[in-house]
């Protein structure tokens, strides 16, 4: 739960827990005007502010999760994530402080995205009071996912998982009991949280390759929409 | 829920050294823990953090393998290679705070009480 | 990312208020945090996102800031605020030499 955040999430407008910070999903103005002393967002501080979006949607889906079932403390995690093929950052990927590698890095975080976005559509119907929020944190992804191709060079080495595959697994994740459903719900959101924030690290660990500026609108409160790829 | 850091005594320039730090209260398998240094009389100096599910650990620029930090699963550990006089400081472990309660940064909420550690000849 | 904090030391009477600032050498959004040490002890957290009240921390002190230049204020000092303040930023990734400031030492007359 928010130590500091006053009402409850409602629509996409995701709170961003700071009043300098009010952030919109992608493709929607906000409603605030940009504080005249901003810098324009740079491509590497477009990409830090998606993510973070993106990972305070998950925080709101995980608060909703947390609160009508006991997985959050349950010690039979082991046994559902066997069944689930959940993207993980490991020390070949690249995007550890030891070893790391721009191309390899970015390569295994894009992919990385790509094979949660069935795990993504999975979640779609599994929250009441939070349907948007999981919408907004699935269409957010998909623009991160654009945003971050476009940075990459090696784009032959991103493989995109087969369709079939993924219908075959959606439908498999759907038919699983009532307890199994909401242990990987809360497996999803919970290596979807930690898979972000170690892209995040790895992301800023990049700087150069990312820090081109590509806004000269100066819309410092407007996240990345399909018109800025 | 609590910290504490034990290991640190008198060792000559070049002898290396483990701290570790114990928690209770809280599950390491769940929060990401850091060590940072103070030398007597100065600032505090942030050595590196050791992330949780993924297992990679961030250092300080100025590290350079002088600090080694590893993670089981029920102590943090901090390796001093190759100490020298100017590693002579009070160590301490804390624990950084979940995303759910602080945000996309890293917020260190719990600490122990440091343990002092002297490279002399 | 460096952090650097002004003044090093401030002395304040009794009552009177306090005002610490720290500078980020590249934009570190709202991602700062303050931490009080007394002499002796283990710091003890007081705000993060550079503004919110870690809790039980007495509503005295309050912080603001974006970017680049955050501020840390006592307002009503009392003898037991007497302590070395620190700023950290809480950008992991990236080239980080130190996540904290050098601290300001508050002396209470």
């Known amino acids: 739960d928010y130590k500091d955040h006053d009402g409850d999430y409602k629509d996409h407008d995701i709170d961003y827990k700071d009043d300098d910070d009010k952030l919109v999903p992608p493709g929607e103005d906000s409603k605030d005007v940009a504080a005249p002393h901003r810098q324009p967002l740079t491509s590497s501080e477009r990409i830090d502010k998606q993510i973070r979006y993106i990972l305070d949607g998950i925080s709101a889906l995980r608060k909703e999760t947390c609160n009508k079932s006991n997985m959050c403390e349950s010690s039979k995690e082991a046994l559902a994530e066997n069944n689930l093929n959940l993207p993980k950052m490991a020390e070949k990927d690249g995007c550890f402080q030891s070893g790391f590698n721009e191309e390899t890095c970015l390569v295994k975080i894009i992919t990385g995205l790509l094979e949660f976005e069935v795990y993504l559509e999975y979640l779609q119907n599994r929250f009441e009071s939070s349907e948007e929020q999981a919408r907004a944190v699935q269409m957010s992804t998909k623009v991160l996912i654009q945003f971050l191709q476009k940075k990459a060079k090696n784009l032959d080495a991103i493989t995109t998982p087969d369709p079939t595959t993924n219908a075959s697994l959606l439908t498999k994740l759907q038919a699983q009991n009532q307890w199994l459903q909401d242990m990987t719900t809360h497996l999803i959101l919970r290596s979807f949280k930690e898979f972000l924030q170690s892209s995040l690290r790895a992301l800023r660990q990049m700087g150069d390759l990312i820090s081109v500026p590509v806004d000269s609108r100066g819309s410092e409160q407007k996240l990345i929409s399909e018109e800025d790829l | 829920q609590s910290v504490e850091e034990s290991g640190g005594r008198l060792v000559t320039p070049g002898t290396p050294l483990t701290l570790t730090c114990t928690v209770s209260g809280f599950s390491l398998s769940s929060y990401a823990m850091t060590w940072v240094r103070q030398a007597p009389g100065k600032g505090l100096e942030w050595i590196g953090t050791?992330?949780?599910?993924?297992?990679d650990t961030w250092y300080a620029s100025w590290v350079k393998g002088r600090f080694t930090i590893s993670k089981t699963s029920t102590t943090v550990d901090l390796k001093i290679t190759s100490p020298t006089t100017e590693d002579t400081a009070t160590y301490f472990c804390?624990?950084?705070?979940?995303?759910?309660?602080?945000?996309?940064?890293?917020?260190?909420?719990?600490w122990g009480p440091g343990t002092l550690v002297t490279v002399s000849s | 990312y460096d952090m650097t904090q002004t003044p090093a030391s401030v002395e304040v009477a009794v009552g009177g208020t306090v005002t610490i600032k720290c500078q980020a050498s590249?934009?570190?959004?709202?991602?700062l945090s303050w931490y009080q040490q007394k002499p002796g002890q283990r710091p003890k957290l007081l705000l993060y996102?550079?503004?919110t009240l870690a809790s039980g921390v007495s509503s005295r002190f309050s912080g603001s800031g974006y970017g680049t230049e955050f501020t840390l204020t006592i307002s009503g000092v009392q003898c037991e605020d007497a302590a070395t303040y620190y700023c950290?930023?809480?950008?992991?990734?990236?080239?980080?030499?130190?996540?904290f400031g050098g601290g300001t030492k508050v002396v209470v007359v």
């Open positions: 050791s992330y949780v599910y993924s297992g």
């Open positions: 804390a624990r950084v705070g979940d995303y759910d309660d602080y945000g996309a940064h890293d917020v260190f909420d719990s």
């Open positions: 950290q930023q809480g950008y992991t990734g990236g080239n980080v030499d130190n996540a």
């Open positions: 590249e934009s570190i959004s709202s991602w």
């Open positions: 996102r550079a503004s």
